[in-house]
């Protein structure tokens, strides 16, 4: 199997395999991987709602608590991301683990993840067209950050 | 230029250019860019010190503040990748961004990156040999989160 | 026209502290990593540690242990160096150096600032 | 940290002269090397990168080559504006390093 180098695209170079034979599913995988929720959900899932919990998964034990939400799209390689959702507007107590704090503010990090896009490739037509790899700069949340609100100045 | 799927690393399937022609520069600076530290820096960035600032990025301003350690490898796709270190062991207190409060712990985040390491391919010998991409979890800290310790049933 | 601009020179005593600037101007400071070597007289160049300001990312030689801090502030497009603890040892001229790279083949610094001359003397 | 030897540490020679400077690595560096010209009382420019790329502007008589733990800087034609020390580093692996420079005089 080759993946060539296809000199059309817009972004290049970009890899181009016919449409006849597709990336390979493993290849696609691997990308696919790299992108999987950070923090894998243990024991129960708890329910979505703003407060810290004292056990399971790292994202519900934060006081600025977030679920993962999935973004599919079978055209592009990472196929699944993930994008934290934060649960709550403000930090929550550490007292109680669940009154929300007006002096802190949860905040999602956000970070600009690359990611493939298959296009079919500028001036291939018919049956057998190559696709290419158009490559994007994507945004997604990775977590939920307690941080006190910005003073300006 | 052909990347070809090469079947005898043993992490299959793997990008094979040969040495004198290198894997495209652009291709790998694409997955170089997908790791670029999540945050970008507005305005100082404050020196290292356990204390939540109420201005500057995010990292900075996070009741559990981290900085970002470069970790460079040039056998690697991507080579930069960026490692969070928490600044305090438990929580800054959003009343004063400078005491620590013992009821919340400032945690690493972790999250098992796909990097790719530049390996000889298995059966191929002489000057223009051909090279692996072979595929690796690897493990980065994305941030630091202030979270209620764990009890223990 | 790219340009690193440092600032003046500087004699401290023993245990003090110094603090060099480096103000950068034509490209985009963001994008590119900046080291700091240092220059003793009739030695050789050491590479002291380099920050991306994109975000504040760090990577310092361990040899100076700890004594060293990088830090940038992106509005002012400068990157400072701190250096703590001074001893004799360390006079020399420091230079701030962009960092080209390829992403892939090379990293190599390609633009530097004039240096700034620090003279640690009792 | 990787240690980087260059010979000789000085060296005379006559204007048009083929000059060669050598740097040695402790360990394998694959070609992950560059090459810095230092002029006396100036502060240090790029002449070569990744072992044998020259640099923007850097003259054709400049040339290098290796692979490994040796490389070499060549100066096919020496000219009188060539006097300087020369200073290899590598990138393979933090912290970065630098030979102990070459001082480069015209007889």
């Known amino acids: 199997v080759s993946l060539r180098i296809q000199e059309g695209c817009s972004h290049l170079p970009s890899c181009c395999p016919s449409k006849e034979q597709e990336p390979p599913e493993e290849w696609l995988k691997w990308s696919s991987a790299s992108v999987s929720p950070p923090e894998p959900l243990s024991h129960t899932h708890h329910a979505e709602s703003c407060r810290a919990s004292k056990d399971g998964p790292l994202n519900s034990r934060a006081i600025s608590p977030w679920s993962y939400e999935l973004d599919r799209d079978l055209n592009r390689v990472p196929q699944d991301l993930y994008h934290a959702r934060c649960l709550c507007p403000h930090c929550v107590s550490l007292q109680t683990g669940s009154h929300m704090d007006p002096l802190g503010n949860s905040v999602p990090l956000y970070h600009n993840q690359t990611v493939f896009y298959r296009r079919p490739c500028h001036g291939e037509e018919g049956t057998h067209r190559r696709y290419c790899l158009e490559r994007r700069l994507y945004r997604v949340s990775l977590a939920c950050v307690c941080v006190r609100p910005r003073v300006m100045a | 230029v052909s990347l070809r799927i090469q079947e005898g690393c043993s992490h299959l399937p793997s990008c094979c250019p040969s040495k004198e022609q290198e894997p495209p520069e652009e291709w790998l600076k694409w997955s170089s860019a997908s790791v670029s530290p999540p945050e970008p820096l507005s305005h100082t960035h404050h020196a290292e010190s356990c204390r939540a600032s109420k201005d500057g990025p995010l990292n900075s301003r996070a009741i559990s503040p981290w900085s970002y350690e470069l970790d460079r490898d040039l056998n690697r796709v991507p080579q930069d990748l960026y490692h969070a270190r928490c600044l305090c062991p438990h929580c800054v207190s959003l009343q004063t961004g400078s005491h620590m409060d013992p009821l919340g712990n400032s945690v690493p985040l972790y999250h098992n990156q796909t990097v790719f390491y530049r390996r000889p391919c298995h059966g191929e010998e002489g000057t223009h040999r051909r090279y692996c991409l072979e595929r690796r979890l690897y493990r980065v800290s994305l941030a630091c989160v202030c979270v209620r310790p764990r009890v223990m049933a | 026209e790219v340009q690193l601009v440092e600032s003046g020179a500087e004699v401290k005593k023993p245990g003090a502290s110094v603090k060099v600037s480096c103000k950068a101007s034509g490209y985009s400071f963001s994008g590119y990593t900046m080291n700091w070597v240092r220059q003793a007289p009739g030695q050789r160049l050491e590479w002291m540690g380099l920050i991306n300001p994109y975000n504040g990312g760090t990577s310092y030689n361990q040899n100076f242990k700890g004594r060293v801090t990088l830090t940038v502030d992106t509005s002012a497009s400068t990157a400072y160096l701190e250096l703590n603890s001074l001893r004799s040892e360390d006079t020399g001229v420091y230079y701030c150096?962009?960092?080209?790279?390829?992403?892939?083949?090379?990293?190599?610094?390609?633009?530097w600032g004039q240096g700034t001359l620090v003279t640690v003397s009792s | 940290d990787i240690q980087m030897t260059q010979s000789p540490s000085s060296l005379s020679a006559s204007v048009g002269d083929r000059v060669t400077i050598t740097c040695s690595a402790s360990?394998?560096?694959?070609?992950?090397l560059n090459w810095y010209q230092q002029k006396p009382g100036k502060v240090p420019k790029l002449l070569i990168y990744?072992?044998?790329s020259l640099h923007s502007g850097v003259p054709s008589r400049f040339s290098g080559s290796g692979s490994g733990t040796d490389f070499t800087l060549t100066i096919s034609s020496l000219q009188p504006e060539d006097v300087a020390t020369y200073y290899c580093?590598?990138?393979?692996?933090?912290?970065?390093?630098f030979g102990q420079g070459t001082k480069l005089e015209i007889k």
């Open positions: 150096a962009r960092e080209d790279y390829d992403g892939y083949l090379y990293f190599a610094m390609d633009y």
């Open positions: 990744y072992t044998s």
């Open positions: 580093q590598q990138y393979l692996a933090f912290p970065y390093t």
């Open positions: 360990q394998g560096i694959s070609n992950y």
